[in-house]
C-alpha cells in the first residue's frame, strides 16, 4: 500500500522537516531556516513563530516543530498557545481599563491574574464566618451556631471595618 501510495503521490514520502519541492521535480527538500513542517507530505514549510516584545521564547523553533512563546516577567499568557500576554496585578487587585485596581469591598483575588471574586456567603450553607475576608483572601466559614456544643459561643466576628477605597459603590 505504501509503495502504491508513493507511486501516486511522491510527496507522501517527504518526512516532517522537509517539503515536497515542485520546483525540483517533487523531491524532498529540507525546510529553509526559520521554517518548519510538523507532518510529512507537506508542499510548503510554515514560518516559525517569533517571540518578540512582551513575548519570550520558551522553546526554539526546529525543522519539525514551531517555536513556543511565554510572557516576560510581570505578564501572563492568555489564549491558545499563549496568543496574548496580559499584565500581572498584585494579589487583592484586578486588571481594569485603568490598570491594576484594588478589589471592591466584599470581593477578593488571591492570584496575580483574573478578576476579583465575591467572598463566600457562609450563611447560604448555614454556617458562620470564622475568619473575615480581605482583598486577598476569601472568608473562612465555621460551624453553624447549632453545631456548637452547649455553652460554647459562636466565633463570628463583627463585620470587618471597611478599608480605605473599599466602600460599596
Amino acid at each position: 500500500f505504501e509503495r502504491t501510495r508513493s507511486l501516486q503521490d511522491p510527496c507522501s514520502n517527504c518526512p516532517a522537516g522537509t517539503f515536497c519541492d515542485n520546483n525540483r521535480n517533487q523531491i524532498c527538500s529540507p525546510c529553509p531556516p526559520n521554517s518548519f513542517s510538523s507532518a510529512g507530505g507537506q508542499r510548503t514549510c510554515d514560518i516559525c513563530r517569533q517571540c518578540k516584545g512582551v513575548f519570550r521564547t520558551r522553546k526554539e523553533c526546529s525543522s519539525t516543530s514551531n517555536a513556543e512563546c511565554d510572557c516576560t516577567p510581570g505578564f501572563h499568557c492568555l489564549g491558545a498557545g499563549c496568543s496574548m500576554c496580559e499584565q500581572d496585578c498584585k494579589q487583592g487587585q484586578e486588571l481594569t481599563k485603568k490598570g491594576c485596581k484594588d478589589c471592591c469591598f466584599g470581593t477578593f483575588n488571591d492570584q496575580k491574574r483574573g478578576i476579583c471574586r465575591p467572598w463566600t456567603n457562609c450563611s447560604l450553607d448555614g454556617k458562620s464566618v470564622l475568619v473575615n475576608g480581605t482583598k486577598e483572601r476569601d472568608v473562612v466559614c465555621g460551624p453553624s451556631p447549632a453545631d456548637l456544643s452547649p455553652g460554647a459561643s459562636s466565633v463570628t466576628p463583627p463585620a470587618p471595618a471597611r478599608e480605605p477605597g473599599h466602600s460599596p459603590q
Epitope: G79, A80, S83, E94, K97, K101, C104, R117, P168
Partner: antibody, heavy 125, light 110 residues
C-alpha cells in the same frame, strides 16, 4: 465556522429544573470565557452567569444565585446552565455567548463576540 | 431597574447622526471596558463595539464608541433604515462581580 448551538429549553412547572446546553465550534473554546444572557418577553438583556475559560471561576447575577449553576466541559466544547427552583420570573429566551479569547480576563469586558441562536424557557403551571 | 442607564428611544432621519448614551458608575462603566450590542427583534444580539471604542471585523466605521468617566456613548453616522434595532451597552461590575447591561435603546430611522 465559529458558532454556538443551543439546546435544552422548554416548558417547565414552577419549582422545576432544566439544563441548557451550548455546543461551541470553530474557535478555541477552552480559552474563552463564556456567559449566559437572558431576555424576558418584551424586556431588555439581563446577564445571568459567566465562567472563566478553565472553569475555575463562576459568577452569577443576584437574581439566580443559589438556584442556577454554570459549568463547562472543555473536552466536549460545551457550556451548561443548570436551573433549579424555577419561577415565572425566569421565563425568557436564554442566550449563550462567548466572551472572547482571554482565559483569565473579565467575563464581559472584552465583549461577547459570538452568540447562540437562543432557546426559550417557559415556566408555567 | 438597571444599574446602567440608557434612554428608552432615539430617532433620526436617514443619513443623519444619532448618539446613544450609557450612564453607569465607578465600579462598572468607569472602571471596566464597555461593549455595545445591536439586536434586531427576534434575533440574537450582535457585538458592535468592545473595549470602549474598538470595532470587530465586519462592523462599518459608521459605528463608533467612546467613554468619559462613568459614561459611554455610541455614535451612528449616515443612518440607514437597516440600523433600526435595539441597542444595549454592557460592562463588568466589579462591586457586584457580575455583568450588567443598560436597559436598551430603541432606534427608529424616520
Amino acid at each position: 465556522q465559529v458558532q454556538l448551538v443551543q439546546s435544552g429549553g422548554g416548558l417547565v412547572q414552577p419549582g422545576g429544573s432544566l439544563r441548557l446546553s451550548c455546543a461551541a465550534s470553530g474557535f478555541t473554546f477552552s480559552s474563552s470565557a463564556m456567559s449566559w444572557v437572558r431576555q424576558a418577553p418584551g424586556k431588555g438583556l439581563e446577564w445571568v452567569s459567566g465562567i472563566s475559560g478553565s472553569g475555575d471561576s463562576a459568577y452569577y447575577a443576584d437574581s439566580v444565585k443559589g438556584r442556577f449553576t454554570i459549568s463547562r466541559d472543555n473536552s466536549k466544547n460545551t457550556l451548561y446552565l443548570h436551573m433549579n427552583s424555577l419561577t415565572a420570573e425566569d421565563t425568557a429566551v436564554y442566550y449563550c455567548a462567548s466572551g472572547g479569547n482571554y482565559g483569565s480576563g473579565t467575563i464581559v469586558s472584552h465583549g461577547m463576540d459570538v452568540w447562540g441562536q437562543g432557546t426559550t424557557v417557559t415556566v408555567s403551571s | 431597574q438597571s444599574v446602567v442607564t440608557q434612554p428608552p428611544s432615539v430617532s433620526a432621519a436617514p443619513g443623519h447622526k444619532v448618539t446613544i448614551s450609557c450612564s453607569g458608575n465607578s465600579s462598572n462603566v468607569g472602571r471596566n471596558y464597555v461593549s455595545w450590542y445591536q439586536q434586531v427583534p427576534g434575533t440574537a444580539p450582535k457585538l458592535l463595539i468592545y473595549d470602549d471604542n474598538k470595532r470587530p471585523s465586519g462592523i462599518p466605521d459608521r459605528f463608533s464608541g467612546s467613554t468619559s468617566g462613568a459614561s459611554a456613548t455610541l455614535v451612528i453616522t449616515g443612518l440607514q433604515t437597516g440600523d433600526e434595532a435595539d441597542y444595549y451597552c454592557g460592562a463588568w461590575d466589579s462591586s457586584l462581580s457580575a455583568g450588567v447591561f443598560g436597559g436598551g435603546t430603541k432606534l427608529t430611522v424616520l
